[in-house]
């Protein structure tokens, strides 16, 4: 009888085991395990009747197709075989074991005890058949296996072969190289590659197969496995395969499709082709006078481009438009896209006017073409050129006026500072104790009039200032502070400020320049209790024209020391020139200034310690800070006074021979102006140079409005 076994393991014993088996007996055990497994069989006990070639009793192990082993006896001899330690493996998932005993047994034989189990088949090492083995990588697992592919490949639907995705190859360049995937390594299986050469209409593509050509073929049937096909317009060329490459192909089309197909077997190197596109030829372009053409070629065909440029100093002229270069292109009909332009000499045109300056032509006939020269100069003596450059400009090849220092930038005419057209006198007689100034002696002197009409009654006062540039006046902060609020610094409204420049006699303002304020800037740290940081700026609404009576003063270099003791300086102002005049008398007289004609006085700088001590010895909160210095005489008699506030204390700089604003009239007291040992206190301007430039917007060349030490 037959026993069907489907378990993954089990035990098989001869009938009656461990007793002797009966005679004339036949039993078959059919063992079936799942696909991907094989059966392992081994015996723990074996004792059968011996016979020549196991004719009598035996155990036969077989599959559907073959007998794997026949066992009998008790021990292996020449003619019979016992299993002993031998293990029997089925090639597949099925094994049949048949036990047979003949009609008689001379002795008592105990039979056999066998065990079986399902064991995994390692398909990856055992598959020899190309049709079944993995193309790239094989992965075994218990009961089966699977395949995978190298990077860039895709597993085919047969789950075995590796193909590539190669249907999106579009070539738009005029020349190129196309190869089978992985060339010169074997191309992938089960793949369908699609290549498109797509060029502009007017081109014709020619193909040339190169190097190796190796596509799987068949001796009788043309290209049944792998092949290459070429479609150009209506024409289809191919299929091509084998080891002989096709001859060069002129497709006569601008659009070419190449199909390459491989089946699931074979190991062939593939192919490589180069393509190039040709088009109609255009005539050789004519070289313009003073011009050149790039690139220079023997012939020019469709889509070739040439760049026309001109010699240095010349410009390409096309349709009355000047340009640096011009490009033309060979069209598909064999003509150029445009006519060849001409080359025209570069012209810089009329040079730009220079504010406060003049232009002189160095070239005859006032020429403005390439290599012509002009010279800028500034209106002297009131303006000078920034950076002290020559002012010579040459017409460049680009058609731009160029200077070797400034390039294409225009020069700047900056006001000349600290150089009055009338030189200041060296000796000044013993404002108080001062004398009348002559017109043009203090061209930086400004009269600042503040008239607050926003309250009843209208408030009006004045002070002095010093011109720093065409648009800025330097003065003391207390001149521009409204006294309406105590303990707070409220600047007067810019609408209430008028500045007079070039003024000599306040009774005759006709020759003066008057300007309103665009901005009033008080130092943010100005302290009304001790007048520390007593400095301010007024920006004029319009820049003032400079002349003999209106010129700026220079700023000092930023040094904390300030002017040296005993140096002599000048101060001018329309302040009290007579100490016996009271404010009441001035106000009731209707003239709000205290002296009609500008006064000036020469005063020495007082050593800081001496001045500080002189004020500390007085009762009261008088502090001479490091932002102040003092000037005046111990014996008195000469001083600045009310109304001189904000005026510049100027010292002649030895090196540059220019006058520098070292101080601003700030305060003094408590005794009358000009009293013995009452020094005038001045704001030390050198401590504020950086702040001043920050407010005014630092010009490129500070050196022209600032004296450097």
């Amino acid at each position: 009888h037959t026993v069907e076994l489907n378990n993954m393991f089990g035990q098989i014993q001869s009938p009656g085991y461990p007793d002797s088996y009966p005679s004339d007996s036949e039993v078959t055990w059919n063992i079936t395990v799942p696909e991907g497994f094989r059966i392992k069989l081994y015996f723990m006990h074996f004792n059968l009747e011996s016979s020549y070639l196991c004719e009598y009793d035996y155990v036969k192990v077989e599959t559907e197709e073959q007998v794997l082993a026949t066992f009998c006896g008790r021990e292996t001899t020449d003619t019979e075989q016992t299993p002993g330690q031998e293990v029997v493996f089925s090639p597949g998932s099925f094994m049949s074991i048949t036990f047979r005993s003949d009609f008689s047994n001379e002795e008592r034989f105990t039979g056999f005890d066998a065990h079986y189990m399902a064991v995994d088949v390692d398909e990856c090492t055992e598959r020899e058949d190309e049709e079944l083995s993995c193309d790239h990588y094989c992965h075994n697992y218990i009961g089966g296996y699977y395949c995978s592919c190298r990077f860039g490949y895709l597993l085919h639907t047969d789950n075995r072969t590796c193909r590539v995705e190669c249907s999106d190859n579009v070539y738009t360049q005029r020349t190129g190289v196309i190869t089978s995937p992985d060339f010169p390594n074997p191309y992938p299986k089960s793949s369908e590659c699609f290549y498109t050469i797509e060029l502009e209409e007017g081109f014709m593509v020619s193909l040339q197969f190169e190097d190796i050509f190796d596509i799987e073929d068949h001796p009788e049937v043309p290209c049944p496995y792998d092949y290459i096909k070429i479609k150009a317009g209506p024409k289809v060329l191919g299929p091509f395969c084998g080891e002989k490459a096709p001859e060069p192909i002129n497709t006569e089309s601008h659009s070419v499709q190449i199909l390459f197909r491989s089946d699931n077997s074979g190991e062939n190197q593939g192919w490589r082709l180069s393509y190039r596109a040709t088009g109609n030829e255009c005539p050789d372009p004519e070289l313009p006078v003073h011009g050149k053409i790039e690139p220079l070629q023997a012939t020019y065909s469709f889509k070739d481009q040439v760049l026309i440029s001109c010699d240095t100093g010349y410009k390409v002229l096309k349709d009355n438009v000047e340009m640096d270069t011009f490009q033309i292109e060979c069209l598909k009909d064999g003509t150029w896209s445009n006519r060849i332009p001409t080359c025209k000499i570069a012209d810089c045109g009329a040079p730009a006017e220079l504010k406060h300056g003049l232009i002189t032509f160095s070239t005859r006939n006032n020429l403005t073409t390439y290599k012509s020269e002009i010279q800028y100069s500034c209106q002297q003596p009131y303006y000078k050129m920034l950076h002290n450059i020559t002012g010579v400009y040459t017409c460049s090849a680009q058609g731009v006026w160029m200077n070797e220092v400034l390039g294409r930038s225009q020069p700047t005419c900056l006001p000349v500072c600290g150089q009055p057209s009338r030189s200041l006198p060296n000796l000044v007689k013993r404002i108080i104790g001062g004398r009348n100034a002559e017109p043009g002696l203090f061209p930086w002197q400004a009269l600042i009039v503040v008239e607050d009409t926003s309250r009843v009654p209208n408030d009006k006062w004045f002070g002095s200032g010093a011109l720093l540039s065409e648009s800025w006046i330097l003065t003391a902060a207390h001149v521009l502070r409204s006294q309406r609020r105590d303990n707070t610094v409220t600047p007067v409204s810019k609408e209430h400020v008028t500045v007079y420049l070039g003024l000599h006699d306040v009774r005759d303002k006709s020759g003066a320049v008057n300007s309103s304020a665009a901005q009033v800037v008080l130092h943010p740290d100005f302290n009304i209790q001790n007048y520390n940081h007593d400095i301010a700026l007024v920006q004029l609404r319009e820049p003032v024209p400079l002349g003999p009576h209106v010129m700026p003063i220079c700023l000092p270099s930023p040094e904390p020391e300030g002017p040296e003791p005993h140096m002599l300086g000048l101060v001018a102002g329309w302040g009290i020139s007579n100490p016996n005049v009271t404010v009441d008398e001035i106000i009731s007289s209707g003239t709000r200034t205290l002296s009609d004609v500008l006064q000036y006085v020469k005063l020495p700088v007082v050593p800081y310690a001496e001045c500080k001590t002189s004020y500390e010895s007085r009762s009261g909160n008088y502090s001479v800070t490091e932002n102040m210095f003092c000037a005046g005489y111990y014996e008195g008699g000469k001083d600045t006074c009310l109304g001189d506030s904000g005026g510049a204390f100027v010292i002649l700089d030895d090196l540059s021979q220019r006058w520098v604003a070292q101080g601003l009239v700030s305060w003094g007291g408590p005794e009358e102006c000009g009293s013995k040992q009452v020094y005038g206190v001045y704001t030390k301007v050198s401590n504020y140079v950086d702040w001043l430039w920050e407010q005014m917007g630092s010009p490129q060349g500070l050196g022209d409005l600032q004296v450097e030490r």
Partner: antibody, heavy 116, light 112 residues
Framework: QIQLVQSGPELKKPGETVKISCKAS????????MSWVRQAPGKGLKWMGW????????TYADDFKGRFAFSLETSARTPYLQINNLKNEDTATYFC?????????WGQGTSVTVSS | DVLMTQTPLTLSVTIGQPASISCKSS???????????LNWLLQRPGQSPKRLIY???KLDSGVPDRFTGSGSGTDFTLKISRVEAEDLGVYYC?????????FGGGTKLEIK
């Protein structure tokens, strides 16, 4: 230290003129305005107005326009209050105080008596 | 003109006890510059006035910190945390926001 020293007491007849001074010291005079305040006997304080010590421009409260005048002698750091055509009701103590609005330091006061 | 009303007229306080004076204005004292110009001063008997507080709550130098000022708009208060003998006299508030500047009627502080 900051000090405001006023002139001494005044005894005047109606119709006369009085001028009171207030000498300032210990600070930059032109930096602060100067206020004048009246205190009638047994009464409260009344602000009369102020003078801008930099410009010299006076400002008067409505009740003190006409007969009252503020003035300055800047070089002497001294403001003045002048009352013209004195009336009996002008009898009071008059104070100067530093500042147009702050009035942070006060003089000792000047007593003016108007009596026929 | 802005009317300044002080209450009470007289304040009788034991030494060491707190005191509070109110000052109300007929219109807001907040100026266009964002500041409130309300000040307090003390006039001791037979002396000239002395400013104690400016801008509502800022103490003048030398003024003891037992004095505090507070308030905004139209309502202001001066407080003394512990009254001392030297504090007696008449306290005035005044405003410097609206021209002309005006004083309160005064509050007399006397010691019980």
């Amino acid at each position: 230290q900051i000090q405001l020293v006023q002139s001494g007491p005044e005894l005047k007849k109606p119709g006369e003129t009085v001028k009171i001074s207030c000498k300032a010291s210990g600070y930059i005079f032109t930096s602060y305005g100067m206020s004048w305040v009246r205190q009638a006997p047994g009464k409260g304080l009344k602000w009369m107005g102020w003078i801008n010590t930099y410009s010299g421009v006076p400002t008067y409260a409505d009740d003190f326009k006409g007969r009252f005048a503020f003035s300055l002698e800047t070089s002497a750091r001294t403001p003045y209050l002048q009352i013209n055509n004195l009336k009996n009701e002008d009898t009071a103590t008059y104070f100067c105080a530093r500042g147009g609005e702050a009035m942070d330091y006060w003089g000792q006061g000047t007593s003016v008596t108007v009596s026929s | 003109d802005v009317l300044m009303t002080q209450t009470p007229l007289t304040l009788s306080v034991t030494i060491g006890q707190p005191a509070s004076i109110s000052c109300k204005s007929s219109q807001s004292l907040l100026d266009s510059d964002g500041k409130t110009y309300l000040n307090w001063l003390l006039q001791r008997p037979g002396q000239s006035p002395k400013r104690l507080i400016y801008l509502v709550s800022k103490l003048d130098s030398g003024v003891p910190d037992r004095f505090t000022g507070s308030g905004s708009g139209t309502d202001f208060t001066l407080k003394i945390s512990r009254v001392e003998a030297e504090d007696l006299g008449v306290y005035y508030c005044w405003q410097g926001t609206h021209f002309p500047w005006t004083f309160g009627g005064g509050t007399k502080l006397e010691i019980k």
